[in-house]
């Protein structure tokens, strides 16, 4: 049975250019975390394997950074980085647990500062 | 068009060590991870370990991890492998192989380094 | 480590034929599994990823399914240069490990 759950910064924002940190946790589950997908609506961005480390998809590997812990770093925003973000939790012998984070770009120089990862 | 060009064929006594080069070109080389893969006569694939040529940090099959030395050269964009104390077992081919874009496979393979280790 | 089974270990097909090759794993890999195809003194050909997802340039008639622990890799109509050895392998952990492969070849 699952009985985990993602905690996530849930909706932040950032400024045009600046960086950003997603953050997820799993909670309430002893399950073992394997692997860490993160994914931009259906385009894989990065993985996080327990054994063999860090996979930074090509396409984003000039701006993204691992880390920190299973979290990552978006690098030189661009309002077309708006949307909706994913993290999947693989875990055993639980399965996989999902988290979404919804990240708004602004153009101004007046975004919120109220997210909890987020880089000032 | 990828092309992952290695170095020839080596011959070695029990006990030396062997390094294989790997010379990448086609792509941005510090964009995608390298692997290290080999083959024994007759044998299934072997898993050696990887590279990410941007920060050079690696991760290796445990059995081999004592043994084995993955770096590179980004100005060259050339990834080498180097295996010590070799024994007889470790004759195979040895192909370096770049990482896909959606995880811990291999999209693109070098022709093979044929190392045989005799005394 | 990851066990990686094959079955069957060798095939006699013929041209137009349809071929399955059968993956089976030690525990869940979810869809992380790929499959090659290698020819004698040739370097492995990468032909799907992720389970089902078949890597570019790789004619249609070729296919994968499966998730968890059983995969197969599909020739829906054997051509003249599929005839070599097909290896699954999992790029879910450390060591990635593959299949002892399956040969094809001419009946």
């Known amino acids: 049975m699952m009985t985990g759950t993602i905690e996530t910064t849930g909706n932040i924002s950032a400024e045009k250019g600046g960086s950003i940190i997603l953050q997820c946790h799993l909670s309430s589950t002893t399950a073992q975390v394997t692997q860490v997908n993160w994914e931009q609506q259906d385009q894989l961005l990065a993985i996080c394997n327990a054994d063999l480390g860090w996979h930074i998809s090509p396409s984003f590997k000039d701006r993204v950074a691992p880390g920190p812990g299973l979290g990552l770093t978006l690098q030189s925003l661009t309002v077309n980085d708006t949307g909706e973000y994913f993290c999947i939790y693989h875990t055993y012998p639980d399965g996989t647990y999902t988290g979404r984070i919804f990240l708004e770009v602004l153009e101004s120089s007046v975004a919120e500062h109220g997210a909890r990862f987020q880089i000032p | 068009e990828v092309q992952l060009v290695q170095s020839g064929a080596e011959v070695k006594k029990p006990g030396a060590s062997v390094k294989v080069s790997c010379k990448a070109s086609?792509?941005?080389?510090?964009?995608?991870?390298m692997h290290w893969v080999r083959q024994a006569p007759g044998q299934r694939l072997e898993w050696m370990g990887r590279?990410?040529?941007?920060?050079?940090?690696?991760k290796y099959n445990e059995k081999f991890k004592s043994r084995v030395t993955i770096t590179v050269d980004k100005l060259s964009s050339t990834a080498y492998m180097e295996l010590s104390s070799l024994r007889s077992e470790d004759t195979a081919v040895y192909y370096c192989?770049?990482?896909?874009?959606?995880?811990?496979?291999?999209?693109?393979w070098g022709q093979g380094t044929t190392v045989t280790v005799s005394s | 480590d990851i066990q990686m089974t094959q079955s069957p270990s060798s095939l006699s097909a013929s041209v137009g034929d349809r071929v399955t090759i059968t993956c089976r794993v030690s525990?869940?890999?979810?869809?992380?599994l790929a499959w090659y195809q290698q020819k004698p003194g040739k370097s492995p050909k990468l032909l799907v990823y992720n389970a089902k997802t078949l890597a570019e340039g790789v004619p249609s008639r070729f296919s994968g399914s499966g998730s968890g622990t059983d995969f197969t890799l599909t020739i829906s109509s054997l051509q003249p240069e599929d005839f070599a050895t097909y290896y699954c392998?999992?790029?879910?952990?450390?060591?990635?490990?593959f299949g002892p492969g399956t040969k094809v070849d001419i009946k």
């Open positions: 392998q999992h790029h879910y952990g450390n060591p990635l490990t």
């Open positions: 525990e869940n890999i979810y869809s992380y």
């Open positions: 192989a770049r990482e896909g874009h959606y995880g811990f496979y291999s999209d693109y």
């Open positions: 590279i990410d040529p941007d920060s050079g940090g690696s």
């Open positions: 086609g792509y941005t080389f510090t964009n995608y991870y």
